[in-house]
Amino acid sequence: ARNGDDCPLGPGRCCRLHTVRASLEDLGWADWVLSPREVQVTMCIGACPSQFRAANMHAQIKTSLHRLKPDTVPAPCCVPASYNPMVLIQKTDTGVSLQTYDDLLAKDCHCI
Amino acid sequence: ARNGDDCPLGPGRCCRLHTVRASLEDLGWADWVLSPREVQVTMCIGACPSQFRAANMHAQIKTSLHRLKPDTVPAPCCVPASYNPMVLIQKTDTGVSLQTYDDLLAKDCHCI
């Protein structure tokens, strides 16, 4: 699979990690998260042209079949390959606790 | 997360497992796979409306941010949650071998 820098569609247009700033209100978390007030959400965004960052053989098949049957089979999709744990200070019944979420922030991306 | 049967967009339109019939030629495998001549490829296809089959917290965040910034943040995408192994009879330098691929056929789907 090609790496993230040689996107055939032009620089930065293919599947890669982006950071989107979001408030607790944006995320619908204002009623249970105390801190941080704003989150730098890392997510996978971008196109998945042929064999670009293909996660596995399924992604390769998907590319081939999308080429043949574009109306039936979608192109591979840019999704997290792994995550960074994220710590939140949140409200609990008994007060405040430190809670870590494993599946919140994308760490790197691939096409599947 | 809602299960696969209560798609708010109408029956069968949300993220679920589909089977697509493909020949070795379709897949670009004709020069290295001997059998089967045709593959029933199971793949994940369909829309991912709000919280439908959300894989994790990242998917929930993506839904929230897509609602706020649809031009920047894509909706979650329907991808395999797990795979079924598939056995192929393939050509090798020395003749023929039986090879199992773990990441070829989708077993079930979720939105991420």
Partner: antibody, heavy 118, light 107 residues
Framework: QVQLQQPGAELVMPGASVKMSCKAS????????MHWVKQRPGQGLEWIGV????????SYNQKFKGKATLTVDESSSTAYMQLSSLTSEDSAVYFC???????????WGQGTTLTVSS | DIVMTQSQKFMSTSVGDRVSVTCKAS??????VAWYQKKPGQSPKALIY???TRYTGVPDRFTGSGSGTDFTLTISNVQSEDLAEYFC?????????FGGGTKLELK
């Protein structure tokens, strides 16, 4: 550059209280949380708790509830930890450490050596 | 509380060697593990977070790996300045807990 300054030592009588400081510089104080960690001589590290420097929310290790109280003074970019009802078990080095949502404990102070003795 | 076990209290090495410090969690902590280096009389220095991500400025001879319950800090091409104590820490669930430390010494 990021710096967390702590006094080198404190000598306190048993039964008394002590309030140790941790002065931050080189970054925006309220952008990060402040954690406190204990190290007894010849032993490992123990996490005491954390304070959100902008809102003063605190979360403690159950073991240190009632023993440690974390506070901040935004105006001087200083975090404080008060330890009460001191005994010889509280004699240790206490570190403050800057923390975030992903980077955990990325910068540490030099530590304050607390000696509880009569 | 989650117990982090560093079974080797001491490890002997030589300059230029490759050494692996291990850490075992008493339950699954995902990748919420950090590694620190501590020299006598100094404050801990953060090396790795999220099990495998190096902090800015940490030499690339330090590599973290693992997930779930088993974690490793590998130092390739050990330098004299790497002789120190190494601690793992989990931040998967509160209270955060540290391993007992592994001291790296010269053979």
């Amino acid at each position: 550059q990021v710096q967390l300054q702590q006094p080198g030592a404190e000598l306190v009588m048993p039964g008394a209280s002590v309030k140790m400081s941790c002065k931050a510089s080189g970054y925006t104080f309220t952008d990060y949380w402040m954690h406190w960690v204990k190290q007894r001589p010849g032993q490992g590290l123990e996490w005491i708790g954390v304070i959100d420097t902008s809102e003063s929310y605190t979360s403690y290790n159950q073991k240190f509830k009632g023993k440690a109280t974390l506070t901040v003074d935004e105006s001087s970019s200083t975090a404080y930890m008060q330890l009460s009802s001191l005994t010889s078990e509280d004699s240790a080095v206490y570190f403050c450490a800057r923390g975030g949502t992903t980077v955990v404990l990325d910068y540490w102070g030099q530590g304050t050596t607390l000696t509880v003795s009569s | 509380d989650i117990v982090m076990t560093q079974s080797q209290k001491f490890m002997s090495t030589s300059v230029g060697d490759r050494v692996s410090v291990t850490c075992k969690a008493s339950q699954n902590v995902g990748t919420a593990v950090a590694w620190y280096q501590k020299k006598p009389g100094q404050s801990p220095k953060a090396l790795i977070y999220s099990a495998s991500t190096r902090y800015t400025g940490v030499p690339d001879r330090f590599t973290g790996s693992g997930s779930g319950t088993d974690f490793t800090l590998t130092i390739s091409n050990v330098q004299s300045e790497d002789l120190a104590e190494y601690f793992c820490q989990q931040y998967s669930s509160s209270p955060w807990t540290f391993g007992g430390g592994t001291k790296l010494e010269l053979k």
